[in-house]
Interface confidence: low
């Protein structure tokens, strides 16, 4: 029996831990009991052949932050019962080949963020146990063919943030049971047709940061159980027709940050699980009618940074359970009435930093349950008449930064904003941008002896505008509705108002970036 | 062993859909691609198009036109029919195991002569 | 699409000889790149894929190197069995291609 080396802490239950800058080598003797044997933080540079020779009950060796750079090739014999092995966060730019043969029973293997500059085909050729092995975070420019052959039982791999600028199209051609494969952050430009055709179980593919730019139709049409796609930060500029069409279980799909100028029809289903859409930061000018009528689970829908300038009457038919749309940051000037008619359970719905020059007074008809609408910074001179009256859970409205006409017409809207002022948050209110009398004062507290009519140009809405009244016949004016007071700011959910630096941030991290 | 026997008409009259049908043994038609690629004599391999098990199919542009490729899953088999056939269609047709790019497993070819 | 280009068109050489034909792509395809033998009379049979990886099965003698737009394919001693054209083919991306032979004899 070894008692515990002195830099060390060394616990009943055979967990030992030895940390700190001012090991500089391999602390002995190890208690020969030990089934846990954390090193870390360490000035540790090397790992002879002969420091684990006595210890051979250890289960997991946790090796992580040290500055090791070289293994002896016979480092980890007689650690028979290892079964998980973390040589994170060192310094190793290359493993012996036969480094692992006699730790054949492994089912962690953590190798991320070293310098490894390759793995050598047949580095792991005795692990029919490995269920994870990650090596995210090194310098390998390139897999070879066969290194994961043996792998059968793998179960989540992570190759993000390496540098390939290719794969293998039979590089994963074995892993059958893979449920999570990360390739995030490296320079893919292609992905061979058939490269994932294998792994029949994969529930998660990273496949953000890269440099993407088609896609092959049949790319992912054996990952039937994929749940989770992420596709975001590349330089895709079309979907192929039935590109998802084989992905039933999809919840997650992330496409923000490409170069996307279309989606054409059905591009997107059938997808009867998928909850969220992440579209902001592409190219899209316009919508088309049923772009997403195959997704009637959908929650959340981001269409923010785009350049739409048009969305077709349709184009949001089918998503029935849609509840956060983000429209904000494009390019669009007018909205036809019936464009949110199919949403009736929207909450959520951004629409400032656009050119939008007037509403619809139905716009907003059938989505009665909206909790917040955002329509700051747009070309809005006035509102329709009674156009949220029937929102009896609004408790989130901006309006802040647009040209508003504070002339007679504006009356109704601001009685409705006196009464419904707690609606409007604190940070900025509208203000009026004519007539000059009025510039700059605020639409909410203004005196409300406005100046009549102006005389308005054709480029000016007139007041006929206003939708007639009856199509409302529960309100009579803008101000029907009774004021909502809110005592706390956790009641809703405040979407995407924040500067687009910020936007990439809030709705541009996945789980997957994590590791 | 992986097996791909070609099968169809050896002489197909001009302005006619030249059909052919490959059965493969020895393997599943649910993994990888299948392809049919003919010679013509004279001037070497041609790559006509593949179709995947999911029915899923890529062309070659010069055929897009007048060739589809179709796949019967329950008899493990794939199908080619190339329409208005004319005597520069006269060539080995072989069947294919794309194993995505390369072809590991080749049928025998069959000769298909185009004349009336 | 891309157009490989082979050279020689054809060749020939004693047993024992290393014999060196090359195939050049119009772009680049990475190593997506294979190796085919087509001997008198009979089917095509893949040698070599990934530009460099030996297909099962096939002898030793045969190598390939290369990667981008530049591709060898090596025979280091030329056998009698290896009367036969040979063929370099893209997978790189659709539609697959192939170099249009190189047809090699014994002196």
């Known amino acids: 029996y070894y008692g515990c080396p002195s830099e060390c802490t060394c616990s009943r239950a055979s967990q030992v831990e030895c940390t700190g800058a001012q090991i500089v080598a391999m602390p002995s003797p190890l208690p020969w009991n030990a089934m846990s044997l954390q090193i870390l933080n360490t000035h540790i540079t090397e790992l002879p052949e002969d420091k684990f020779l006595n210890i051979s009950a250890l289960i997991a060796l946790k090796m992580e932050k040290n500055e090791l750079a070289n293994i002896m090739p016979g480092a980890f014999r007689n650690l028979g019962s290892l079964r998980h092995l973390s040589l994170a966060n060192n310094k190793l730019k290359n493993l012996p080949v036969r480094l692992f043969q006699d730790v054949n029973n492994l089912e962690t293997l953590l190798l991320s963020n070293n310098q490894l500059v390759q793995i050598q085909p047949a580095q792991f050729s005795q692990f029919s146990n490995l269920k994870e092995l990650q090596l995210y975070g090194n310098n390998l420019e390139y897999i070879p063919e066969g290194v994961f052959d043996h792998l059968v039982g793998l179960t989540k791999l992570n190759l993000g943030n390496n540098g390939f600028t290719h794969l293998s199209p039979r590089v994963f051609q074995h892993l059958g049971n893979l449920q999570v494969l990360r390739l995030y952050e490296n320079r893919l430009s292609d992905i061979p047709m058939g490269t994932f055709d294998a792994l029949g179980n994969l529930q998660e593919l990273a496949l953000q940061e890269n440099q993407i730019g088609t896609l092959s139709p049949g790319l992912f049409h054996n990952n039937r159980n994929l749940q989770r796609l992420y596709l975001s930060n590349n330089h895709i500029s079309h979907l192929p027709p039935g590109i998802f069409m084989q992905l039933p279980h999809l919840n997650k799909l992330t496409l923000f940050g490409n170069s996307l100028k279309e989606l054409s029809p059905g591009v997107f289903g059938p997808m009867p699980n998928l909850r969220e859409l992440w579209l902001y930061n592409n190219h899209i000018t316009s919508l088309p009618d049923n772009a997403f009528s195959h997704l009637n689970q959908l929650q959340v829908l981001i269409l923010s940074h785009n350049q739409l300038s048009y969305i077709s009457p349709g184009a949001f038919n089918g998503l029935t359970n849609l509840r956060e749309l983000s429209l904000h940051t494009n390019a669009l000037q007018d909205l036809d009435g019936n464009v949110f008619r199919s949403l009736a359970n929207l909450r959520n719905v951004s629409l400032q930093n656009n050119r939008l020059r007037q509403l619809p007074g139905s716009i907003f008809a059938n989505v009665n349950g909206l909790m917040t609408i955002q329509l700051q910074n747009n070309n809005l001179e006035n509102l329709p008449l009674g156009i949220f009256d029937h929102l009896g859970n609004l408790c989130e409205l901006r309006l802040y930064d647009n040209p508003w006409r504070c002339d007679s017409n504006i009356l109704p809207l601001h009685d409705w904003l006196i009464l419904n002022r707690a609606r409007l948050g604190t940070d900025t209110l509208p203000v009026c941008s004519s007539p000059a009398s009025v510039r700059g004062q605020s639409l909410v507290i203004i005196n409300v002896n406005f100046p009549g009519p102006s005389v308005q140009g054709p480029e000016t809405p007139e007041v006929s505008s206003y939708p007639d009244t009856s199509s409302y016949p529960d309100s009579t004016s803008i101000s029907s509705t009774t004021e909502i007071t809110r005592s706390t700011d956790d009641d809703y959910t405040d979407l995407n108002t924040i500067e687009p630096i910020d936007d990439r941030n809030t709705w541009g991290m996945t789980d997957a970036q994590s590791g | 062993q992986v097996q791909l026997q070609e099968s169809g008409p050896g002489l197909v009259k001009p302005s006619e859909t030249l059909s052919l049908t490959c059965t493969v043994s020895g393997a599943s038609i649910n993994i990888y691609y299948w392809s049919w690629i003919r010679e013509a004599s004279g001037k070497g391999l041609e790559w006509i198009g593949y179709v995947h098990h999911s029915g899923g199919t890529n062309y070659n542009p010069s055929l897009k036109s007048r060739v589809s490729i179709s796949v019967d899953t329950s008899k493990n088999q794939f199908s080619l029919r190339l329409k208005s056939v004319t005597a520069a269609d006269t060539a080995v047709y072989y069947c294919?195991?794309?194993?995505?790019?390369?072809?590991?497993?080749w049928g025998q070819g069959t000769l298909v002569t185009v004349s009336s | 699409e891309i157009v490989l280009t082979q050279s020689p068109s054809s060749l020939s050489a004693s047993v024992g000889d290393r014999v060196t034909i090359t195939c050049r792509a119009s772009q680049g395809i990475s190593n997506y790149l294979a190796w085919y033998q087509q001997k008198p009379g009979k089917v095509p049979k893949l040698l070599i894929y990934?530009?460099?990886t030996l297909q099962s099965g096939v002898p030793s003698r045969f190598s390939g190197s290369g990667s981008g737009t530049d591709f060898t394919l090596t025979v280091s001693s030329l056998q009698p069995e290896d009367v036969a054209t040979y063929y370099c083919?893209?997978?790189?991306?659709?539609?697959?291609?192939f170099g249009q032979g190189t047809k090699v004899e014994i002196k």
């Open positions: 294919a195991r794309d194993t995505y790019g390369p072809f590991d497993y």
């Open positions: 083919q893209n997978y790189y991306s659709a539609p697959w291609t």
């Open positions: 990934a530009a460099s």
